[in-house]
């Protein structure tokens, strides 16, 4: 799902207030609900009829430093016999997420939000069938 | 997938630098890659063998204000005949994501990161079968 554009109004002070100096804002240290955890089953990526693998990207100047991307293993889906069925398609499920980018020059450290597109997993879809005429 | 704990080291200045005053940091206005967009297939949530619905939550003091949560429509998965097959399970795919929380008292506005658990969609899984003794 997509994150709408900010239009930067979210980060503006009310009109009656003096503007933010130097185009920056105050970000409080600490993360709300930091201990919240995904309750997704282990091995869901292997048991799915549209299985996927994970690739980890690492960037020490990004929070979170580790971003995990899924890649669908198959073109089709796995049927009850464990065989790939090409009449169905394994398709990626994507999500826009925010990360924080750290920028520093000496002791001057600032942060900026960055939008990242994450493929979270895959799902099996029945394609819509169209019959076209050969020419 | 889960976001690791910060341990708050990410937001600290190098040890040789003076500490951040008042437990806050400088967040630059603007979002990197703001125009990046999800390229997910249209109607994937209806075409999936583990279809889902979306619920939108709205909070004007959160960025993004709109957070979309998926709920699996079925317990089982939809087979080639369009019937629900309870020998399989429709299971949610979850992702931890960051949002920004806005806090204001008059003209004093600050922001804080918040971790949110989002169900992005559903996938169909084949459960591992175990035979147990009834008592």
């Amino acid at each position: 799902r997509k994150i709408p554009k900010v239009g930067h109004t979210f980060f503006q002070k009310p009109e009656s207030c003096p503007p933010v100096p130097g185009g920056s804002m105050k970000l409080d240290i600490g993360i709300i609900n930091e201990n919240q955890r995904v309750s997704m089953s282990r091995n869901i990526e292997s048991r799915s009829t549209s299985p996927w693998n994970y690739t980890v990207t690492w960037d020490p100047n990004r929070y979170p430093s580790e971003v995990v991307q899924a890649q669908c293993r198959n073109l089709g889906c796995i049927n009850a016999q464990g065989k790939e069925d090409i009449s169905m398609n394994s398709v990626p499920i994507q999500q826009e997420t925010l990360v924080v980018r750290r920028k520093h020059q000496g002791c001057s450290v600032s942060f900026q939000l960055e939008k990242v597109l994450v493929t979270v997993g895959c799902t099996c879809v029945t394609p819509v069938i169209h019959h076209v005429q050969h020419h | 997938r889960k976001i690791p704990k910060v341990g708050h080291t990410f937001f600290q200045k190098p040890e040789s630098c003076p500490p951040v005053p008042g437990g806050s940091m400088k967040l630059d206005i603007g979002i990197i890659n703001e125009n990046q967009r999800v390229s997910m297939s249209r109607n994937i949530e209806s075409r999936s063998t583990s279809p889902w619905n979306y619920t939108v939550t709205w909070d004007p003091n959160r960025y993004p204000s709109e957070v979309v949560q998926a709920q699996c429509r079925n317990l089982g998965c939809i087979n080639a005949q369009g019937k629900e097959d309870i020998s399989m399970n429709s299971v949610p795919i979850q992702q931890e994501t960051l949002v920004v929380r806005r806090k204001h008292q008059g003209c004093s506005v600050s922001f804080q990161l918040e971790k949110v658990l989002v169900t992005v969609g559903c996938t169909c899984v084949t459960p591992v079968i175990h035979h147990v003794q009834h008592h």
Epitope: - | L75, N89, V91, P127, V128, H130
Partner: nanobody, 118 residues
Framework: EVQLVKSGGGLVQPGGSLRLSCAAS????????MGWFREAPGKEREFVAA????????YYADSVKGRFTISRDNAKNAVHLQSNSLKSEDTAVYYC???????????WGQGTQVTVSS
């Protein structure tokens, strides 16, 4: 290892009622769903009813809709199947199952005989 403790079953007259119960126990597990399938003589095992643990949503086979009701007891990790207006075609061995660990593991127990006959 998940254990399934069942109760109910037996002989009932057409038009009568019966209540089957099944409780999951043993170790630490998170329930995804519980329910019943049934197997009539010479027929394949078919789905009867189930309940999803996360939200309590119930699911029924068309053949039992309006006659059977599935309910759960969260505290006991148990499900109950109330069967009303029973017909001879409901005669079967009923199998309780429990899906755990996010639906990735399914535990089947031994069946319980339900006979609808006058």
């Amino acid at each position: 290892e998940v254990q399934l403790v069942k109760s109910g079953g037996g002989l009932v007259q057409p038009g009568g009622s019966l209540r089957l119960s099944c409780a999951a126990s043993g170790g630490t597990f998170s329930l995804f769903a519980m329910g019943w399938f049934r197997e009539a003589p010479g027929k394949e095992r078919e789905f009867v009813a189930a309940i999803r643990w996360s939200d309590g949503s119930s699911y029924y086979a068309d053949s039992v809709k309006g006659r059977f009701t599935i309910s759960r007891d969260n505290a006991k990790n148990a499900v109950h199947l109330q069967s009303n207006s029973l017909k001879s075609e409901d005669t079967a061995v009923y199998y309780c199952y429990a899906d755990v660990q996010g639906g990735l593991h399914r535990y089947w127990g031994q069946g319980t005989q339900v006979t609808v006959s006058s």
